[in-house]
């Protein structure tokens, strides 16, 4: 058993049949010593009396939250929660495997530059009694500051009798340079709590390897004279980390028709201008990707070409 | 993905054009590594992150954007003092923090270089002869050295006296390449970052 | 033919809500991102937010915490729609649809004004 936060408290569990479960003494946190009972949740059935209880937890049946009371009043509460582990393997029942980029990816996060910001995201199917808290830190053995915020609902989603639940959560690097070289990897620990289970999930990674820029901005194209070709133009996003000689972007500009089956032109340049043919009806595309390293690519942005 | 062959200005800054066929080499020998050593840890996730010029060099900070001084968490800062002449100067106002930073990238090279030859002498050893350095790689810093053209004594290449162990050997030669790939991309974007300023 | 519907633009009071629909039809839209971009008279077109098939929302800084995209996968058509609340009069624009297979497809727009 271990505190999860004040007065919240986690079992682990060996969780098989008849397993024998986990002995746990529980003590009231009063300078009373005499006339105390102890109930579970809403009930008023008196479980024991005196200063400690113990209590075997071996299922969902034995988790909750004991209180111990004198002559009526509330003295202190304990919540126990259940963290499962089956054939040696903690639960994950309540987020969904995302199977992107690989099994058991259950938490997904992307950087729009190198400043030290980055969200991650996470689905369930979970709608109600669920709580979350993130905490991240660079390194594991001699922890470096990362704070992130609370984690909130961004989207649902629904696939016919199911709906599925999109959280997300921004973190920052306390003091993050954008031209350090990685060595310690960022880490992210997700624990969720569903009614009385508690399971925590974590993921690991560089800030090199989840940077995936926001598209070109400002998009346009400018006809050349007596020509079926354009000149489009764009410009850095925003978002992405300066100088931008220094974190330079390279782009990839895609001309497609309405079609499926109509070939796409492609061409890849590290210059924010480029002269292509524009077809009627056709589109005109720009993503972006950063030069040197090359993780994701940006998603696209895009005009028409009429 | 291979980076296009950039055939450089004639009045370009003269390293850019080896910085870039840099970090394609040692992109494409960490690519290979990778596929030829897959039973072994060779991805960037079963890997120790190490630096092997830790300590002896400063390329990071020396190198640094003028922007990014103020960054306060970028000022790290290590002193190191470094030989100041080099032709990557050549008929350019510098100031000594730049020509810290082309000394600093220099000393990596040569210390990147000493470790790869001294691996490579392992790896031709190897009864497997599963995998050897690319010859390319090796070509590559040596002409990103001489464009350099730092004065500095030659390092006698490490000789061992031991039994090679090659599948350490292998595993480290995982490791330098992880951290030479990083460290290639900080000279790249130093190389692009000069050449527009 | 593919066909991106919108509707649920309209006049709204600084403070309200509207909730915008697109109903995208014509191609299998399962696996593809949709989103909703806005353009105000004079300005660039910009995302609002947007949505994968898989995971990884995203909402401009501007309309944090005040709108709210979800989808809808049905057998032939995908359904986006942009629940927008605690709107302020610098959210008038004409909201765009917009989804990403293989290339891009934009809806005609719908006018949301937000005035008192």
């Known amino acids: 058993i271990w505190e999860l936060k004040k007065d919240v408290y986690v079992v682990e569990l060996d969780w098989y049949p008849d397993a024998p479960g986990e002995m746990v003494v529980l003590t009231c946190d009063t300078p009373e010593e005499d006339g105390i009972t102890w109930t579970l949740d809403q009930s008023s059935e008196v479980l024991g009396s005196g200063k400690t209880l113990t209590i075997q937890v071996k299922e969902f049946g034995d988790a909750g939250q004991y209180t111990c009371h004198k002559g009526g009043e509330v003295l202190s509460h304990s919540l126990l929660l259940l963290h499962k582990k089956e054939d040696g393997i903690w639960s994950t029942d309540i987020l969904k495997d995302q199977k992107e980029p690989k099994n058991k990816t259950f938490l997904r996060c992307e950087a729009k530059n190198y400043s030290g910001r980055f969200t991650c995201w996470w689905l369930t199917t979970i709608s109600t009694d669920l709580t979350f808290s993130v905490k991240s830190s660079r390194g594991s053995s001699d922890p470096q500051g990362v704070t992130c915020g609370a984690a909130t609902l961004s989207a649902e989603r629904v696939r016919g009798d199911n709906k599925e639940y999109e959280y997300s959560v921004e973190c920052q690097e306390d003091s993050a340079c954008p031209a350090a070289e990685e060595s310690l990897p960022i880490e992210v620990m997700v624990d969720a709590v569903h009614k009385l289970k508690y399971e925590n999930y974590t993921s690991s990674f560089f800030i090199r390897d989840i940077i995936k820029p926001d598209p070109p901005k400002n998009l346009q194209l400018k006809p050349l004279k007596n020509s079926r070709q354009v000149e489009v133009s764009w410009e850095y996003p925003d978002t992405w980390s300066t100088p931008h000689s220094y974190f330079s972007l390279t782009f990839c500009v895609q001309v497609q028709g309405k079609s499926k089956r109509e070939k796409k032109d492609r061409v890849f340049t590290d210059k924010t201008s480029a002269t292509v043919i524009c077809r009627k009806n056709a589109s005109i595309s720009v993503r972006a990707q950063d030069r040197y390293y090359s993780s994701s690519w940006s998603e696209w942005a895009s005009v028409p070409c009429s | 993905r291979n980076l296009p062959v950039a055939t450089p200005d004639p009045g370009m800054f003269p390293c850019l054009h080896h910085s870039q066929n840099l970090l394609r080499a040692v992109s494409n020998m960490l690519q290979k590594a990778r596929q030829t050593l897959e039973f072994y840890p060779c991805t960037s996730e079963e890997i120790d992150h190490e630096d092997i010029t830790k300590d002896k060099t400063s390329t990071v900070e020396a190198c640094l954007p003028l922007e990014l001084t103020k960054n306060e968490s970028c000022l790290n800062s290590r002193e190191t003092s470094f030989i100041t002449n080099g032709s990557c100067l050549a008929s350019r106002k510098t100031s000594f923090m730049m020509a810290l930073c082309l000394s600093s990238i220099y000393e990596d090279l040569k210390m990147y270089q000493v470790e790869f030859k001294t691996m490579n002498a392992k790896l031709l050893m190897d009864p497997k002869r599963q995998i050897f350095l690319d010859q390319n790689m090796l070509a590559v810093i040596d002409e990103l050295m001489q464009a350099l053209n730092f004065n500095s004594e030659t390092v006698p290449q490490k000789s061992s006296l031991e039994e090679p162990d090659f599948y350490k050997t292998k595993i480290k030669l995982c490791i330098l390449l992880h951290a030479f790939r990083i460290r290639a991309v900080t000279i790249d974007r130093v190389m692009s970052y000069l050449n527009a300023s | 033919e593919v066909q991106l519907v919108e509707s649920g633009g309209g006049l709204v009071q600084p403070g309200g809500s509207l909730r915008l629909s697109c109903a995208a039809s014509?191609?299998?839209?399962?696996?593809?991102?949709m989103a909703w971009y806005r353009q105000a008279p004079g300005k660039q077109r910009e995302l609002v937010a947007s949505?994968?098939?898989?995971?990884?929302?995203?909402?401009a800084d501007s309309v944090k915490g005040r709108f709210f995209i979800s989808r809808v996968y049905a057998k032939n058509t995908n359904t986006v729609y942009l629940q927008m609340n605690s709107l302020k009069p610098e959210d008038t624009a004409v909201y765009y649809c917009?989804?990403?297979?293989?290339?891009?497809?934009w809806g005609q727009g719908t006018q949301v004004t937000v005035s008192s």
């Open positions: 917009y989804a990403h297979i293989d290339s891009d497809y």
């Open positions: 014509g191609r299998d839209f399962d696996r593809s991102t």
């Open positions: 949505i994968p098939s898989d995971i990884g929302t995203k909402y």
